[in-house]
Amino acid sequence: LKGQEFAPSHQQVYAPLRADGDKPRAHLTVVRQTPTQHFKNQFPALHWEHELGLAFTKNRMNYTNKFLLIPESGDYFIYSQVTFRGMTSECSEIRQAGRPNKPDSITVVITKVTDSYPEPTQLLMGTKSVCEVGSNWFQPIYLGAMFSLQEGDKLMVNVSDISLVDYTKEDKTFFGAFLL
Amino acid sequence: LKGQEFAPSHQQVYAPLRADGDKPRAHLTVVRQTPTQHFKNQFPALHWEHELGLAFTKNRMNYTNKFLLIPESGDYFIYSQVTFRGMTSECSEIRQAGRPNKPDSITVVITKVTDSYPEPTQLLMGTKSVCEVGSNWFQPIYLGAMFSLQEGDKLMVNVSDISLVDYTKEDKTFFGAFLL
Amino acid sequence: LKGQEFAPSHQQVYAPLRADGDKPRAHLTVVRQTPTQHFKNQFPALHWEHELGLAFTKNRMNYTNKFLLIPESGDYFIYSQVTFRGMTSECSEIRQAGRPNKPDSITVVITKVTDSYPEPTQLLMGTKSVCEVGSNWFQPIYLGAMFSLQEGDKLMVNVSDISLVDYTKEDKTFFGAFLL
């Protein structure tokens, strides 16, 4: 039997087959965030658990210093959910005082950093105005999409306000990527 | 030609190639829920359509009694959306009465049950406070992520209140998983 | 070495292996929408960027005239996020006037057009009541799931109100699909 037996007719020799279990993959879960300095006008990055509980990295996908490192060029599906929680937003306090209703907001950004390019690239953004009436509120923002990444690219998750991130459970706030 | 011709150099012989069409996959869609008893402090599980309409299970991924059965160990992408709908939440009723604004909430949990472990594992949770001003509200919670599962694991979707689940259309509330 | 060496025992000869990089894939990003006529009772379809910035189509997955064209039968993961933004919804204006609180809503539908049936099939729907108190609001709706598609099927994203779609950034509103 020839090695080509299972290969469809339109597959070229230069497109190598891959064992799926061999592909770079990671699922990271939330940990309590330590307040860190971040540049003004730049959202702070979350750091993550990468080994304990549900979290894992495999097949040369590594996590270091808030970044997922892409070990191999290709198309990746990237996803994250961040659960936010807070007290009554400024919006409703302002409303009671009769001032204009400028809503607060919560934002999640999945960002790519490439050595060959000076500015980070925002891949995905979920942003939501928060103008809650109740005294305590909580809600998730979920993101996920496919992107062509290069070996050496780094991925991180940035949020508008780290103090609002719910870090209590690994199933509420997470970040992952896998090579397709 | 040797069988290894299409195999990248870092692929070991023990990592078998797979035909993608052969992988376990399922997309389940909502049906009207029959009220069932569930343990106090435990969210009820939804049951699903698995063959009619857009729903399907294939390649040994089976659905039975509210559970998706994992037929093969590996990394799976698991997702669900639940659309909730309700009348004005208690929160706004309470607010009008001048009592503290404890918001109601809606929650979806994707849960893994493993025979070898007595307690279910919560893989994913989406939870949101509901403190709506309008008399009727509706909104989806979406979840999706990758997990390493073992043959024999069972997946289910639990919700905080089955009576709030919108079961009217198969595109509004669904649950799926596929081997990567 | 035989070509079957890497094939698991349950894989039949008729299930060809595929190089992953050869699979149809697309990630489309938002552009400013030009108002177009649409049928009464039918949500308008968004059009998309398919080449610039983060957007791409590859391996015979083509974008034309608001549609993604499916070049090959199989199971696809399909996703979209639409970020909506607006001024205070009618709901809160009505509330102040003491009339019943019928909430406005925002809706995203991923629709399949197929030769097999004359009416479009709604694959995924995300719908949310909007009854905001703040004077400006914004929020995303995310959808994603797996579907069995046929060669020649066409996918589009419909929204309840094109004028509310945030087209300012490619990371806020997007649409994609890839063969599993």
Epitope: - | R32, E51, L52, G53, L54, Y167, T168, K169 | E119
Partner: antibody, heavy 120, light 111 residues
């Protein structure tokens, strides 16, 4: 050409049982959901039950739930309806119907029907 | 009992136009489920007449047309002919019943 041919109808006493069959040809039977629809004499159409192509999903009208069982044998291209605890109000012509496009929920082909009479 | 409501009968002279209404609810037609129409000639099995709200299977004359709006639908027959004398049923899916639902049926008489 799609053909559906029902059989098994007849006269049965209240409380009795009957098994209807529907032989299908002209299409890939296992790819389609199938239904039973009935029509009482001089009355309108009433959906009775549906079964998915692979047979794993079944649904019933409330009026027959717990008494009727729909099933199929894809190797024989045959649909069945097992009717137990029959009542006078089950008297009707029973049609087997092929589902059209999935998610559209309609019947594109019907059999000619078989008459079930429940009477003492 | 039927979930979809139709008029019991309509009639018209040959060549005239008649319409049959079909009224549902928020769990069937109003939920977005398509409406389909069947014609049942005396003593025969029903036959699909209109599917997907407004589409005719091959062989159905273009005198028959369907439409849907909100929680209701309608079937129109233009240029009524003697062979159109039959019972007509609308049909949809109902999520609260997890099943198919038919209209009460309308007898069309050609005067």
């Amino acid at each position: 050409e799609v053909q559906l041919l029902e059989s098994g109808g007849g006269l049965v006493q209240p409380g009795g049982s009957l098994r209807l069959s529907c032989a299908a040809s002209g299409f890939t039977f296992s790819n389609y959901a199938m239904s039973w629809v009935r029509q009482a004499p001089g009355k309108g159409l009433q959906w009775v039950s549906v079964i998915s192509g692979r047979g794993g999903s079944t649904y019933y009208a409330d009026s027959v739930k717990g008494r009727f069982t729909i099933s199929r044998d894809n190797s024989k291209n045959t649909l069945y309806l097992q009717m137990n605890s029959l009542r006078a109000e089950d008297t009707a012509v029973y049609y087997c119907a092929k589902d059209g496009y999935s998610s559209a929920w309609y019947f594109d082909y019907w059999g000619q029907g078989t008459l079930v009479t429940v009477s003492s | 009992q039927s979930v979809l409501t139709q008029p019991p009968s309509v009639s018209g002279a040959p060549g005239q136009r008649v319409t049959i209404s079909c009224t549902g609810s928020s769990s069937n037609i109003g939920a977005g489920y398509d409406v389909h129409w069947y014609q049942q000639l005396p003593g025969t099995a029903p036959k699909l007449l209109i599917y997907g709200n407004s589409h005719r299977p091959s062989g159905v004359p273009d005198r028959f047309s369907g439409s849907k709006s909100g929680t209701s639908a309608s079937l129109a027959i233009t240029g009524l002919q003697a062979e159109d004398e039959a019972d007509y049923y609308c049909q949809s899916y109902d999520s609260s019943l997890s099943g198919y639902v038919f209209g009460t049926g309308t007898k069309v008489t050609v005067l």
